[in-house]
């Protein structure tokens, strides 16, 4: 259990402000399952406030880690029988210490809302909610005051002078004299060979064995060859099984093992830790984290849990590094800022994703009649006639140059150019002189000065002006 | 290796006292959190719970039994006594015996049963 | 007493075919359910307790699943030794009672 800020949330940041230290508070709130969430509405089936917190002394500069939630359980008296399904609310408050604290010495630093299905009695539930830059980690159950009994606490288990048919130590049910309490039930999964509980939920192992199920074999140096020792000395077995062995996850779901215990990924409709929990609808609140829940308006019918950036699983449970999916194309680096992705690109590289290379010619355009060309790892554009510019957007005057050799006189034509060549001279741009006894024209210009070709002395007007 | 073992009159006469015993071996009721218990099981029948008896001589039994019933246990001989009386041809059963771990009330290990009769 | 319905009373299966057996409580227990199978002239064998969890030995095949109320035992693919009756029983609280049983026979 803890409150800290979530991952992904930049910096952890410690709760205390500049003022001093602080103290955590957790207020836990009931309402009814019908109750609008939103509305400030009474707690109607219970109230409280937890204790004997720890002092917590970071200043606003130091990183804090998550915080770790006092050891004392938060207990909320509920008034008549247990629901099942209600909405729970969990405020975080900061009470700021100090002689000189100065201002309200209480804040109200998060608060979540969910709704929930339980049965009293049943094993402990965990949940993770964020709340903006928080996140609060948490378990909860709930559990019957003698002398009620059953999932609803609606039955009472009261003392008789006359010896009951129940046994020792448990009293019959009253208004249902055939029905005793409940005994001792140990946690969901404590194997029936070599685990026990002495108190509801829990599971204490028997000589040789370990693990929270207690189906680990307990390794000694007196059993070779990888074997273990058996129960109560009797020999060494090969190894016992590890916590996913007989697959712990009910309705379809797939165990893996997360240090020493198992984690179940849920299959839809289903969640809890096992996957045990079924037959949910949308008003139970089963997507978690803020999850936005369709359909499922009877158990019958499937729901559907659309979760919010950063999470994943059928409830919405699982927090997912949406770096790990590599987004960012082109080598780009991924930033998950938890409400959103972002991409640093490299040079040359731009987009949401990092996908439009600015060197090359996908996705870029030329503008009236202009071809991309691609070369020496840049790319430009190759302009029609009468255009200019990087995107060929300018309006160029192809006479500004002076194209026209020998004097000729340079006309701007819609398709170009034209040169009025001086007596004497001839071609496209005037380069040629007729020699006047009927000898073929030689070239006037030095080779290599092509000026008649278009393309080439917009691409020079472009860089003359850039 | 963990066994149990099941011994007793194969026949009884209607309103005798039926008193079977169940031998175990490879654990012991001085373990905290072991028990025994009986099953029994007419011929081509269900299974029945009977009782169950703990370490801490915690004892449990089926309530509309529970008046016939009786267990017992003597732990350095690593045996459990089950005493039935006024015995009935209903009765009639695969009497088993198992281990059950305190607040596990599962049988994880069972005997291989003693079929009794009750017939005059 | 919580009482425990089985179904179908008997399924006829060949060797090979997927096996779904069902066990009813009349009240809620939890996910507090096992299944045992017992073969003629033996005595009983867990198979799965706390509804899904597969006890010491047992083969993948078997898997349960459910809460509450209602469960199932499935067997993926039969082979000829899974042929036996079975028996669901709960610990959920006071008296501890079985299923009828479901005797799955070979068709």
């Known amino acids: 259990h803890s409150f800290g800020p979530g991952p992904g949330l930049g910096t952890p940041r410690s709760p205390c402000n500049a003022r001093g230290p602080c103290r955590l508070f957790f207020r836990v709130c009931l309402k009814p399952g019908v109750s609008q969430e939103a509305t400030e509405s009474l707690c109607a089936l219970g109230a409280a406030l937890s204790t004997s917190v720890p002092v917590y002394t970071e200043h606003p500069g130091e990183s804090a880690a998550a915080l770790p939630l006092p050891d004392g359980l938060v207990r909320v008296p509920f008034r008549d029988a247990w629901p099942g399904t209600f909405s729970l609310v969990i405020e975080t408050w900061r009470e700021q210490l100090g002689e000189h604290a100065g201002g309200p010495a209480w804040n109200l630093l998060a608060r979540v809302v969910g709704r929930r299905r339980l049965a009293a009695g049943g094993p402990w539930a965990r949940d993770v909610q964020r709340t903006g830059t928080w996140e609060l980690h948490f378990s909860y159950r709930a559990r019957c005051e003698p002398p009620a009994v059953g999932a609803a606490c609606a039955r009472l288990c009261r003392s008789r002078s006359a010896p009951s048919r129940c046994g020792p130590g448990l009293r019959p049910c009253t208004p249902f004299p055939d029905e005793c309490e409940a005994p001792s039930v140990c946690r969901p999964g404590c194997s029936p060979e070599h685990g026990y509980c002495e108190e509801p939920d829990e599971c204490r192992c028997l000589e040789g064995w370990t693990g929270p199920l207690c189906t680990v074999p307990v390794s000694t140096s007196s059993c070779l060859n990888s074997r273990v020792p058996g129960p109560a000395s009797t020999g060494c077995l090969l190894p016992g099984p590890g916590p996913c062995d007989g697959n712990p996850c009910a309705n379809g779901g797939s165990c893996s093992e997360t240090s020493g215990s198992f984690e179940c990924a849920c299959p839809r409709g289903f969640y809890g830790l096992r996957c045990e929990v079924s037959g949910v609808t949308c008003a139970d609140g089963p997507c978690f984290n803020g999850g936005l829940c369709v359909g499922g308006e009877d158990p019958d019918s499937a729901y559907v849990c659309h979760c919010p950036p950063g999470f994943q699983g059928s409830n919405c449970e699982k927090r997912v590094d949406r770096c790990s999916l590599q987004p960012c194309q082109n080598g780009g680096l991924c930033l998950d800022l938890g409400h959103a992705l972002r991409c640093r690109c490299r040079a040359g590289f731009a987009g949401p994703r990092c996908e439009h290379d600015l060197d090359d010619c996908a996705g870029r355009a030329c503008a009236n009649g202009g071809t991309c060309v691609e070369g020496g790892g840049s790319r430009r554009c190759s302009c029609a006639l009468g255009f200019g510019g990087r995107d060929c957007r300018e309006r160029a005057d192809p006479c500004a140059s002076r194209p026209c050799a020998h004097g000729g006189r340079c006309y701007a034509h819609f398709s170009g150019l034209v040169c009025a060549c001086a007596p004497g001279y001839m071609g496209v741009r005037c380069e040629f002189a007729v020699r006047p006894d009927g000898a073929d024209a030689v070239p006037a210009a030095p080779r290599g000065l092509r000026q008649a070709d278009p393309q080439r002395f917009l691409h020079h007007h472009h860089h003359h002006h850039h | 290796q963990i066994t149990l073992k099941e011994s007793g009159p194969t026949l009884v006469k209607p309103t005798q006292t039926l008193t079977l015993t169940c031998t175990f071996s490879?654990?012991?009721?001085?373990?905290?959190?072991?028990?025994v218990g009986w099953i029994r099981q007419p011929p081509g029948k269900a299974l029945e719970w009977l009782a169950l008896?703990?370490?801490?001589?915690?004892?449990r039994y089926s309530p509309s039994l529970q008046t016939r019933l009786t267990i017992t246990k003597d732990t350095p001989k690593n045996q459990v006594v089950l005493t039935m009386t006024n015995m009935d041809p209903v009765d009639t059963a695969t009497y088993y015996c198992?281990?059950?771990?305190?607040?596990?009330?599962?049988?994880?290990?069972w005997g291989r049963g003693t079929l009794v009769t009750v017939s005059s | 007493e919580i009482v425990l319905t089985q179904s179908p009373a008997t399924l006829s299966l060949s060797p090979g075919e997927r096996a779904t057996l069902s066990c009813r409580a009349s009240q809620s227990v939890s996910s507090y359910l096992a299944w045992y199978q017992q073969k003629p002239g033996q005595a009983p064998r867990l198979l799965i307790y706390d509804a899904f969890y597969r006890a010491t030995g047992i083969p993948a095949r078997f898997s349960g699943s459910g809460s509450g109320t209602d469960f199932t035992l499935t067997i993926s693919s039969l082979e000829p030794e899974d042929f036996a009756v079975y028996y669901c029983q709960h610990r959920s609280n006071w008296p501890i009672t079985f299923g009828q049983g479901t005797r799955l026979e070979i068709k």
């Open positions: 008896i703990y370490w801490n001589d915690d004892k």
């Open positions: 490879g654990f012991s009721l001085s373990t905290r959190g072991v028990g």
């Open positions: 198992a281990r059950s771990n305190w607040g596990n009330w599962y049988f994880a290990l």
